[in-house]
Amino acid sequence: QPDAINAPVTCCYNFTNRKISVQRLASYRRITSSKCPKEAVIFKTIVAKEICADPKQKWVQDSMDHLDKQTQTPKT
């Protein structure tokens, strides 16, 4: 889980070691702050859980792409 050391900076210290189904992901944000030990992506799931993931992993990149496309698609 992400850890807010000194708000408003949130850092990830561990990454999930399992793929999370892309259909369970609602949004993401990138963590690039120099105050954090590593770059990360924090996914928020459809039930509002926050999960730290490694931006170098392909499934993480695919998931971000999927969410980006979803955001661009107008709702009918």
């Epitope: 399992r18 259909q23 799931t45």
Partner: antibody, heavy 119, light 113 residues
Framework: QVQLVQSGAEVKKPGASVKVSCKVS????????IHWVRQAPGKGLEWMGG????????IYAQKFQGRVTMTEDTSTDTVYMELSSLRSEDTAVYYC????????????WGQGTLVTVSS | DIVMTQSPGSLAVSLGERATINCKSS????????????LTWYQQKPGQPPKLLIY???IRESGVPDRFSGSGSGSNFTLTITSLQAEDVAIYYC?????????FGQGTKVEIK
Amino acid sequence: QVQLVQSGAEVKKPGASVKVSCKVSGHIFTELSIHWVRQAPGKGLEWMGGFDPEDGETIYAQKFQGRVTMTEDTSTDTVYMELSSLRSEDTAVYYCATNDFWSGYFDYWGQGTLVTVSS
Amino acid sequence: DIVMTQSPGSLAVSLGERATINCKSSQSILFRSNNKNYLTWYQQKPGQPPKLLIYWASIRESGVPDRFSGSGSGSNFTLTITSLQAEDVAIYYCQQYYSSPWTFGQGTKVEIK
């Protein structure tokens, strides 16, 4: 194509434990979340628990908490479900089921394992 | 926990006639951001594991005949078999996969009248 192959039928006495296996093939094991669903004779489907990557751990239905343990052996791509303190009401077919990265629902099921609890 | 309630419990329909099964969730299983309902329908025949028919409430699984259709949104869902065939005799279950614990309806048995 994911394939789930389960161990054979078991007959157990009340109070004993049973361990059912589910071998996964056709997919990278660690990319799947395996769940267990049971069905008592003439009854409906009941979710027992499974690995939840959102929590990073195995979660169990409250009804089975403390009596069920689900483990995995990544060297053999096999998942196990152990149910202890068996009673006659645990007589059921036990299924393993999984979803892949692009789904989220159970699109693959094992063939089922009948566990009979009888004295 | 989200409770799934199916109706009716059983249904007898003449060959070629329409069968309609309802499923109600105790809370909405629609995620508005992606406009998806986290609901599936399964068909189960004796001695077999459940077979996926419909996912996202209305999308037919590959290979499922087009006489099967799913509809509904939010908390109310329907599975329709437009022209019942002998091979459709089975028990049908809805299931939500919005939040754990994943829960099933109690099942609807479809028979030939």
